[in-house]
């Protein structure tokens, strides 16, 4: 079901929000040995006109914001998405119960922007 | 005023939508000489569980989708954003009325994904 903000004017500008994810909460505790969880973070907030420098907006996002202003029924605002992501190392059991240490890319949000 | 999706279950999956932008429509015709417009396109659609291969989802987006499923009030779904952008060349007048040819990066959406 949809989980929407009913009053977009009450939403803050696009930014990084802190979020710790426990692998037990995800139900992954039987195959992930370590870590027990990690600071994944997430991006959320409005990408509204005018897009300021903090919003790391692309040229396309600037154009899209203007098109949305004039045609909100047809073109959405740009969305608030990660612009910088980091990897984490995970120790886990593979399908054959071998213990593997692997680096998983793009797991941690370091910065957000309007895209 | 708010602009919300009332029926996100009826929204299509994250994908690229075609959009031609005329510089006259943006009110930029007095300083952009050529082109008259360009195929900017945009991304829109749902990033819902399960994220399939077409959605070019990052590892973080996969994790965020699961966290959203369990905590929809606190963590949004990942958003549908450009994954590949192209440049366009623009001929325009600068502030001193000189004619400039410049390549503007990240102007055209070539592909979308869940981020």
């Amino acid at each position: 079901s949809a989980s929407d903000y009913n009053s977009s004017e009450l939403k803050t500008a696009c930014r990084k929000h802190e979020l710790y994810v426990s692998f037990q909460d995800l139900g992954w505790q039987d195959w992930i040995i370590a870590p027990k969880g990690y600071a994944a973070n997430y991006c959320d907030g409005e990408c509204s006109f005018p897009l300021n420098a903090h919003m790391n907006a692309t040229n396309h996002a600037i154009v899209q914001t203007l098109v949305h202003l004039m045609n909100p029924e047809y073109v959405p605002k740009p969305c608030c998405a990660p612009t910088k992501l980091n990897a984490i190392s995970v120790l886990y059991f593979d399908d054959n119960s071998n213990v593997i240490l692997k680096k998983y890319r793009n797991m941690v949000v370091r910065a957000c922007g309007c895209h | 005023s708010a602009s919300d999706y009332n029926s996100s279950e009826l929204k299509t999956a994250c994908r690229k939508h075609e959009l031609y932008v005329s510089f006259q429509d943006l009110g930029w015709q007095d300083w952009i000489i050529a082109p008259k417009g360009y195929a900017a396109n945009y991304c829109d659609g749902e990033c819902s569980f399960p994220l399939n291969a077409h959605m070019n989802a990052t590892n973080h987006a996969i994790v965020q989708t699961l966290v959203h499923l369990m905590n929809p009030e606190y963590v949004p779904k990942p958003c549908c954003a450009p994954t590949k952008l192209n440049a366009i060349s623009v001929l325009y007048f600068d502030d001193n009325s000189n004619v400039i040819l410049k390549k503007y990066r990240n102007m055209v959406v070539r592909a979308c994904g869940c981020h």
Epitope: L69, M70, N71, P72, E73, Y74, V75 | S1, S3, D4, Y5, N6, S7, L10, K11, T12, S22, Q24, D25, L26, G27
Partner: antibody
């Protein structure tokens, strides 16, 4: 040809709700947005809100935000505007109108008179 | 919100004459996103002009629009009996869409 046909006139008591329908034909319903505009006696035309018939996205004018709901039924190619907590000032002719990207309202319904009276 | 003010409120003219009336915006309308509508008694508004000066297909060429920025004009040359109606301007460059209060063109 494009046609928007609205439901008939309504008389309502203060505090009640009214639901006006707008049936579309002659174009691809889900590709366009439909707006609602009203005109009270002696007043200017007043925009109330819109719905995109394809994805169900809506936006409402701040003035009506708490009282109006715009919905659609794709199978019936019909859009609805429901206004609640009616008061005498809501007596007006209500119109649905289609809008295309970058353009104004190109086709309008014939209008529905809603009278609010005790 | 862009406030539109039309003048005059009423114009009394005879068939064959030229009607000209104005629509002034409270702030600049970028890209001339201004439309003109005609409304005859008991009918829905009918789009005449968009983009301040572009005539809709099927609208007679006696109707013309002009202007930019904050000042716009609708001119009707050689008034026909069916042109006596109320004319509204509208800003359509995004939410909220706003209308002028209307100019009534009546038979003198």
């Amino acid at each position: 040809q494009v046609q928007l046909v609205q439901s008939g006139a309504e008389v309502k008591k203060p505090g009640a709700s009214v639901k006006v329908s707008c049936k579309a034909s002659g174009y691809s319903f889900t590709n366009y947005a439909l707006h609602w505009v009203r005109q009270a006696p002696g007043q200017r035309l007043e925009w109330m809100g819109w719905i995109h018939a394809g994805n169900g996205k809506t936006e409402y004018a701040q003035k009506f935000q708490d009282r109006v709901t715009i919905s659609r039924d794709i199978s019936a190619i019909t859009v609805y505007m429901e206004l609640s907590s009616l008061r005498s000032e809501d007596t007006a002719v209500y119109y649905c109108a289609r809008r295309q990207l970058w353009l104004p309202f190109d086709y309008w319904g014939q209008g529905t008179l809603v009278t609010v009276s005790s | 919100e862009i406030v539109l003010t039309q003048s005059p409120d009423t114009l009394s003219l005879s068939p064959g004459e030229t009607a000209s009336f104005s629509c002034r915006a409270g702030q600049i309308i970028i890209n001339r996103q201004l439309a003109w509508y005609q409304r005859r008694p008991g009918q829905a508004p009918r789009l005449l002009i968009y983009g301040a000066s572009n005539r809709v297909t099927g609208i007679p060429d006696r109707f013309s629009g002009s202007g930019s920025g904050t000042d716009f004009t609708l001119t009707i040359n050689r008034l026909e009996p069916e042109d006596f109606a109320v004319y509204y301007c509208q800003h359509y460059g995004g939410s909220p869409w706003t209308f002028g209060q209307g100019t009534k063109v009546e038979i003198k």
